[in-house]
Interface confidence: low
């Protein structure tokens, strides 16, 4: 069937359109185009005879039409009047006619639109604004954009006048945005330039910053006021109701207590005509005095005296704070605070209570610290220490003894020999000693402030012959693979060589054996049961030598994994079962038995007479060494056959 296709269907003014013919019949005489939906000679555009290839314009020919041999019609420089139907009349060679109608629509090329507004400065929560998209164009669609987004759904937004008018009711500051309108028709789309809606608003209630309302005397007061407003607000300051200045900031240097009061900021918007105020109350405090600490006892005696530290001055409605060693007060039954925290009492002071101590006065603004103070705790003297620790000396050497005792103030020292006062010095020196210098040497330390004295007595033996040494031990019952043992050869003697023997042999080389303290001390690390031997120490100098009695090391070990004997596991019914358990252990372990998990007896030997198959099962021996705290066990299966 003959059809006409318009390409394009919607044509912009000034462009061209092709009326394309489809299914054109064969053996044609010619064809003719008409304006409209029927064949009307008065509205013929052009005719075409195929045989002569002659095109003849008709009454409706405008000079813009071109006919093609395939009967298609091109119309150029389209005008609005070209809109409508076009009919093709085809005359076949057999003079049978055929008709087809096509159509197209002509639209103008849209101009760039613009936005007009009925109110260039609307007031928030009061005015409405109507935006209109210009120009008014027929057959055009109107669209609106806010900040390049399509219109939000809002009861305050209304489209009218075929969407050409956008009305914003009761505008708010949030409506301050970029607005664009767009016109569309089938052949073009154009957007306007942005229009920024300038909403007048405010002022809101002003904000005064900073927020703090308490100041110290002598500080600078610098207040700033801000209120959201369009156009920006004009500011005024009032102090206690009296106008001060028309600025956004209020600055008062070096304030005093007299500057306390109510500070009002007023914000004014000249366009909206509105005023808003905010009031803040400023309190100026006098600078508190720097606190200091007084003590009721300048020289307390350790373990005797109490000390009361008081934070001065006394101020009403003030919080007192304390620090010791730069930290808040520790919880201690020896520390007591008065009800107002102003007095800190140290009960029964010790030498560790020296401090430093600080107190503080807290007001609304800050904490003022005192200078730190340290307590002078009188202590000691502790038991004096006499050095060196030698007790045996050879005749002819010099004896030089020094005494020291922890004490505050420093101790005064006295020396006595066999109870007779010698001298009041910290050191005692006797040159070229003889056997007559043997005796009891006493150091007496005296603290003149506390009145306390302590003494230490040392026995000095002057002899060419060395005494028989003895061995002292720091651990009489070491545990295997756990403990170390240090043997020390006594006494400590000057210019003496120390020697050691184990089971009558010189010391073996071992990483577990270590000599120290001039060979006077022998340390055995990680002792084993094999270290349970006889140890002897010896001392010698150029004129004599001597050996100690042997000391046998008692090493606690075990229990090892026990052994159940006899090894048999199969028995005949009616036989006697006699099981014995043994485990290497020092001291001997405690034994217990379990049969099939059920506890039996606490003996080393388990005896059952005339056993039967009912005695089949697991027999477990448990061993425990109370000294080492270790346990062990073994399980044996017994089968009794009938």
């Amino acid at each position: 069937k003959l059809t006409i296709e318009s390409t394009p269907f919607n044509v912009a003014e000034g462009k061209e359109v092709l009326l394309l013919v489809h299914n054109l019949p064969q053996h044609l005489f010619g064809y003719s185009w008409y304006k409209g939906e029927r064949v009307d000679g008065n509205r013929q555009i052009i005719g075409y005879v195929i045989g002569t290839q002659q095109a003849t314009p008709g009454p409706a020919y405008s000079g813009r039409e071109i006919i093609y041999p395939n009967a298609s019609l091109l119309i150029q420089n389209i005008i609005q009047n070209d809109t409508g139907f076009y009919t093709l009349h085809v005359i076949k060679s057999d003079l049978v006619n055929e008709e087809a109608t096509g159509q197209f629509r002509v639209y103008p090329e849209l101009p760039k639109p613009s936005i007009s507004s009925n109110n260039s400065k609307p007031v928030e929560d009061k005015d409405a604004v109507a935006f209109t998209c210009e120009p008014e164009t027929q057959d055009a669609t109107y669209l609106w954009w806010v900040n390049n987004q399509s219109l939000p759904v809002s009861p305050r937004l209304q489209l009218s006048n075929g969407n050409r008018t956008l009305t914003l009711f009761n505008v708010t500051r949030n409506d301050t945005a970029s607005y664009k309108c767009e016109t569309q028709n089938p052949v073009s789309a154009r957007r306007s330039d942005s229009v920024i809606l300038n909403v007048l608003y405010g002022p809101d209630a002003p904000t005064i910053s900073p927020l703090n309302t308490s100041y110290r005397s002598g500080e600078n007061l610098n207040l700033s006021c801000h209120a959201a407003s369009n156009p920006p607000a004009q500011y005024s300051w009032f102090v206690n109701g009296t106008f001060q200045q028309s600025t956004q900031e209020l600055f008062i240097p070096n304030i005093t207590v007299n500057n306390s009061g109510s500070y009002t900021c007023q914000a004014h918007n000249s366009d909206t005509g509105l005023n808003r105020t905010t009031v803040t109350t400023i309190t100026v405090y006098a600078e508190p005095p720097k606190p200091f600490i007084t003590s009721n006892n300048s020289n307390p005696v350790e373990d005797e005296d109490a000390v009361a530290l008081t934070c001065e001055p006394e101020i009403q409605n003030t919080t007192y704070l304390w620090w010791v060693n730069n930290q808040s007060l520790p919880v201690s039954p020896r520390l007591q605070l008065s009800n107002d925290n102003r007095t800190l009492t140290l009960l029964s002071v010790t030498r560790n209570d020296v401090g430093p101590y600080e107190c503080g006065i807290q007001n609304e603004l800050s904490v003022d610290h005192s200078d730190p103070v340290i307590l002078n705790v009188l202590y000691g003297p502790d038991d004096p220490t006499i050095s060196p620790s030698y007790t045996y000396y050879r005749p002819g050497v010099n004896l030089s003894l020094s005494c020291h005792a922890a004490s505050n103030p420093p101790a005064q020292y006295s020396w006595l020999i066999d109870g007779n006062i010698q001298q009041h010095t910290q050191e005692l020196f006797i040159s070229n000693i003889t056997e007559k210098n043997s005796g009891l040497y006493t150091c007496q330390a005296n603290n003149s402030a506390s009145g306390h004295s302590r003494t230490t007595v040392k026995t000095i033996t002057v002899s060419a012959e060395l005494p028989k040494p003895s061995i002292s031990s720091n651990n009489s019952k070491p545990v295997e693979d756990k403990d170390a043992v240090a043997f020390t050869c006594e006494p400590e003697a000057q210019n003496t060589t120390y020697l050691w023997w184990v089971n009558g042999q010189s010391l073996p080389v071992s990483p577990r054996l270590q000599l120290s303290n001039g060979n006077r001390t022998l340390t055995l690390f990680n002792v084993t049961r094999n270290d349970a031997r006889a140890y002897v120490c010896g001392i010698q100098n150029s004129v004599s030598a001597n050996r100690s009695d042997p000391v046998t090391l008692d090493v606690l070990y075990g229990p090892d994994t026990p052994i159940i004997s006899p090894p048999d596991s199969s028995y005949l019914s009616g036989a006697n079962l006699n099981l014995s358990c043994h485990s290497a252990s020092n001291p001997s372990p405690q034994y217990s038995w379990r049969i099939n998990g059920i506890p039996q007896q606490h003996t080393q030997v388990l005896f059952i007479a005339k056993i039967t198959p009912n005695n089949n099962g697991t027999y477990a021996c448990f061993v425990s060494n109370l000294a080492t705290g270790r346990n062990n066990s073994i399980v044996k299966s017994i089968t009794v056959s009938a």
């Epitope: 200091f292 300048s298 020289n299 030498r351 200078d371 730190p372 103070v373 002078n376 505050n408 420093p410």
Partner: nanobody, 124 residues
């Protein structure tokens, strides 16, 4: 008459060391806490270190802890300040001070006797 005489000051390069001494006379030295203070030009006198009468406790300002060591020899009536790893900001007039039994101040308050000072200059 009580006298405190400082010595040992001088010019030293950054990172260097100095040992200040303060000899005391006219007082029972072993009953006094001894302190060192310093004063830089245009600044207040500040605490450096203190040592109590027995020598068992010492106290230091944070700015010198670990670099300066205070010690005393009661037999010689002398207190010392060993200054290591010196810095330009250590430049000051260093004073020796004595305080009798009682709460020990880590500030100028409470020190009864003062020396004339010895100048320490740390400069490259």
């Amino acid at each position: 008459e009580v006298q405190l005489v400082e010595s040992g000051g001088g010019v030293v390069q950054p990172g260097g060391s100095l040992r200040l001494s303060c000899a005391a006379s006219g007082l029972t030295f072993s009953t006094y806490t001894m302190g060192w203070f310093r004063q830089a030009p245009g600044r207040e006198r500040e605490f450096v270190a203190a040592i109590i009468w027995s020598g068992s406790n010492t106290y230091y300002a944070d700015s010198v802890r670990g670099r300066f060591t205070i010690s005393r020899d009661n037999a010689r009536n002398t207190v010392y300040l060993q200054m290591n790893s010196l810095r330009p900001e250590d430049t000051a007039l260093y004073y020796c001070a004595a305080q009798h039994f009682g709460p020990i101040g880590l500030t100028t308050r409470g020190y009864h006797y003062w020396g004339q000072g010895t100048l320490v200059t740390v400069s490259s």
